[in-house]
Interface confidence: low
């Protein structure tokens, strides 16, 4: 189920799957929500630790049991991923942080009159992930009203420093507030060039596009279909970026499909989940559980309810069925995508709907914080 | 909203506009989306006004002037007014609207979390009121959704300011001693939301007040936490599953 309570002065021991710098616990929680394996997080505000390297540290954690031992740590904040929390799942983060400088690659500097205008510039720049703004009272006069647009390899700051008269924040592209607009077109038999930022396996180009949309550095993608000539590259989804923000070249190529991230769309973004079920397809991955259920939809529901489950395969092989119920294989992987995709099997596969934000499985829990 | 500023897209995605289509169409009240098919508002929005078929509910909007005849809207399936609401009093000023068709959630249209039943222990320090209502007492409906940050006032303090009315424990007040910031006509039924532990909660429903933004005359809101049992009871579907965003 959905657990939204935060544990103050508590730190989860062990289970680390990733770490990064975030300006507060809420942003850390959001990163945990969108991380394929993160179930729990712990955040160290600047006031909670003397170690400069760990200040603003956000630690994403996994646990087979869904929980980890809590240790007392003054100032620390811990909590749960919002996977399975329906409408609360959003990559949109509007807060502006005063007295904080979020470090990254500064690729654009301009003079603006307010932090809101700086945030708007970041939102309207295809490469900008976060920004810092030096206010009118910044100690160095030449930097006053400077708006620095930034990016980093992981989409989060490479460091966060406490600095007076500086305000920082994130792009509002995930809030569907970008003025850039987006290309909805899917280009059949076309491959894009440029830098690959990640490689995952997907059953179709639409899943590839959604993954690209929610990847911090993906601006466009190329997908190799299941009939692509090189067997080892079938169903490969290449997430790509470039200096200019658009592909520098494209090559006509049979059985490839290319397209763009939808992060810059106005007013509507795709849901960060994939609801389609793929008949005759087997998704390979680490086995989480096997259960007998009646029908592929129940298998998908079972996967959705089991928070660690990322995808599933429902087998219709006679040896996998008992009366009306057949085996439902609940699976996971490091990146949330299948480790192999096989065709022509007797069964169907699909993804957990745990990140869908339209489900009625969501609740707003209001348990008080544990001190 | 008096003393407020323009909101931005998706900032208050639960805010809805309750409009009546008669000879003309106008915004009358605000409301809060609390589930795919449920809106929470003030009972007094329906005082003496045509019901059901003439109401249009607009969600996921920022600017009322963007509404055209082609703008999608929800229609009302059922209005549930609190059984103890009396037109003559400020008490129990709460109503639920069941929409004819469920809404999909987007960044611009999604529900607000409700408080837990009888929530009295939480100290809310970051509270906002939103709406398209008048920006001054003798004003007019605003085009762009307005927001204003207003501190909560204790019921004891509020009662001192309203000697002629009973401020009950099922009300919550908000305002500045010096006035200047408040809800006003047309904001009724809309949300008073407070951010706590990174999450927005619906603390109040805009209900009444003497004038708007007057000195030592806080706004009075229906306290949602006091009506959680009622909300849950009324929103249970026939299969017993709550159709709104209820506390665990």
């Amino acid at each position: 189920g959905c657990l939204t309570q935060l544990y103050e002065n508590a730190f989860f021991r062990g289970g680390d799957v990733a770490s990064m710098y975030t300006p507060n616990a809420q942003y850390c929680q959001m990163r945990c929500t969108f991380h394929p394996r993160c179930l729990l997080f712990s955040f160290l505000p600047a006031s909670s630790i003397n170690d400069m390297e760990k200040r603003f540290g956000c630690f994403l954690k996994d646990s087979v049991t869904g929980t980890l031992p809590k240790v007392h740590r003054t100032g620390a904040v811990s909590g749960h991923s919002l996977k399975q929390c329906g409408h609360q799942i959003s990559a949109c983060h509007r807060d502006i942080y005063k007295g904080v400088d979020m470090r990254g690659v500064n690729f654009n500097v301009s003079k603006v009159s307010s932090v809101e205008e700086c945030q708007k510039r970041c939102t309207s720049n295809i490469r900008c992930q976060f920004f810092s703004y030096a206010t009118q009272t910044f100690h160095k006069a030449e930097y006053r009203n400077n708006c620095l647009l930034k990016y980093s390899p992981g989409g989060t700051p490479t460091a966060i420093k406490v600095l007076s008269n500086v305000e920082s924040g994130f792009s509002l592209k995930p809030c569907a507030l970008s003025e850039i607009g987006c290309h909805m077109n899917i280009f059949q038999h076309l491959a894009f060039s440029d830098v690959d930022v990640a490689r995952v396996l997907t059953p179709d180009a639409f899943v590839c596009r959604t993954i690209c949309t929610y990847h911090p550095n993906c601006l466009f993608f190329t997908f190799y279909t299941n009939v692509w000539k090189i067997e080892s590259q079938r169903n490969v989804c290449l997430l790509k970026t470039s200096e200019s923000g658009t592909p520098s070249s494209s090559t006509p190529q049979e059985n490839t499909i290319s397209g763009y991230s939808l992060l810059t769309c106005k007013r509507t973004l795709p849901e960060p989940c994939h609801s389609k079920i793929y008949p005759g397809v087997d998704f390979g991955g680490e086995e989480l559980n096997v259960t007998f259920v009646k029908g592929v939809n129940v298998c998908q529901e079972t996967c959705t309810k089991m928070i660690r489950c990322q995808f599933f395969t429902y087998s219709l092989l006679p040896e996998d069925c008992k009366e009306e119920k057949c085996k439902c294989f609940l699976r996971l992987s490091m990146d949330g995508s299948p480790t192999r995709i096989a065709y022509g099997t007797q069964g169907s596969s699909g993804y957990s709907l745990r990140l869908c934000n339209t489900g009625d499985n969501s609740v707003c829990t209001t348990k008080t914080s544990t001190r | 909203i008096v003393g407020g500023t323009n909101s931005s897209w998706g900032e208050w995605p639960w805010q809805v506009s309750l409009q009546v289509k008669l000879t003309a169409q106008r915004h009358l009240c605000g409301g809060s989306l609390i589930g795919h098919q449920w809106v929470l508002t003030a009972a007094h929005c329906f005082d003496g006004l045509p019901l059901q078929d003439v109401w249009r509910i607009y969600s996921g909007i920022l600017n009322l002037s963007d509404i055209t005849k082609d703008t999608p809207f929800s229609q009302i399936k059922e209005i549930i007014i609190h059984q103890n609401y009396k037109v003559s009093e400020g008490n129990h000023d709460i109503a639920l609207i069941k929409l004819q068709a469920p809404l999909n959630y987007t960044e611009f249209q999604k529900p607000i979390c409700l408080p837990s039943k009888g929530d009295t222990s939480t100290i809310y320090t970051n509270c906002w009121v939103t709406g398209w209502g008048f920006s001054k007492e003798k004003g007019e409906i605003q085009n762009i959704l307005q927001k204003v940050n207003i501190p909560l006032v204790t019921n004891e303090e509020c009662q001192k300011r309203y000697q002629d009315y009973k401020i009950t424990q099922r009300m919550v007040c908000a305002g500045y001693k010096e006035g200047g910031k408040d809800a006003c006509k047309g904001d009724s039924g809309g949300p008073l939301v407070c951010k706590h532990n990174g999450m927005w909660r619906l603390v109040g429903i805009t209900s009444w007040g003497e004038g708007c933004a007057r000195r030592e005359q806080p706004g009075v809101y229906t306290k949602v936490a006091e009506y959680m049992d009622w909300i849950l009871e009324k929103t249970q579907s026939s299969d017993g599953k709550a159709q709104m965003q209820s506390p665990a």
Partner: antibody, heavy 122, light 106 residues
């Protein structure tokens, strides 16, 4: 003290026009729904027209639709009824009324003026 | 439009009598019904709203009941001051009055 005072009634020929006014005092006029209700001699009450607080919504009984126009001037605390194409059956005492029940920012209906007589006759 | 039908149209009664007036709506109006008293040459005076809520200052001998389409005004013990015409009024969809019930001395 709360008061509603109608004026503008009188004798008019069929097809003629009249403009009724209702001056309000003793309450925040701009916060309330205002109404016109009429009563033909020896007959019952008939609701004629209503106007919402901001003036944006106006509603009419079928019997007067297209001929009568309700309006208000919140700065003058005054309600109006412009009556055109008058007919003999419009002869009545015209009352203005407002919904005063309850706490501020409410919209409910019960305070009445004393009425003004409109006679349509040739 | 919603029609309101009152009965009886005239009622003869004596001081001390219990008097009941009924009002029927052509469709459900929930509890959005008011009762008024009117004396000759005077404006109507609100007695009851929301079907059963007594307006402040109105004697407790007046009471209202009903919901949906059937409503009743009851005067538990008729007083000399109560001889007048009574109107019901719906305010569910627009505003419609019943045709009135005249309560006269028997």
């Amino acid at each position: 003290e709360v008061q509603l005072l109608e004026s503008g009634g009188g004798l008019v020929q069929p097809g003629g026009s009249l403009r009724l006014s209702c001056a309000a005092s003793g309450f925040t006029f701009s916060h309330y729904i205002m109404m016109w209700v009429r009563q033909a001699p020896g007959k019952g009450l008939e609701w004629v027209s209503g106007i919402y607080s901001s003036g944006g919504i106006t509603v009419y009984a079928d019997s007067v639709k297209g001929r009568f126009t309700i309006s208000r001037d919140n700065s003058k605390n005054t309600l109006y009824l412009q009556m055109n194409s008058l007919r003999a059956e419009d002869t009545a005492v015209y009352y203005c009324a407002y919904r005063r029940i309850g706490v501020p920012r409410r919209d409910s209906f019960d305070m009445w003026g004393q009425g003004t007589m409109v006679t349509v006759s040739s | 439009d919603i029609q309101m039908t009152q009965s009886p149209s005239t009622l003869s009664a004596s001081v001390g009598d219990r008097v009941t007036i009924t009002c029927r709506a052509s469709q459900s109006i929930s509890s959005w019904l008011a009762w008024y008293q009117q004396k000759p040459g005077k404006a109507p005076n609100l007695l009851i709203y929301k079907a059963s809520t007594l307006e402040s200052g109105v004697p407790s001998r007046f009471s209202g009941s009903g919901s949906g389409t059937e409503f009743t005004l009851t005067i538990s013990s008729l007083q000399p001051d109560d001889f007048a015409t009574y109107y019901c009024q719906q305010y569910n969809t627009y505003w419609t009055f019943g045709q009135g019930t005249k309560v006269e001395i028997k």
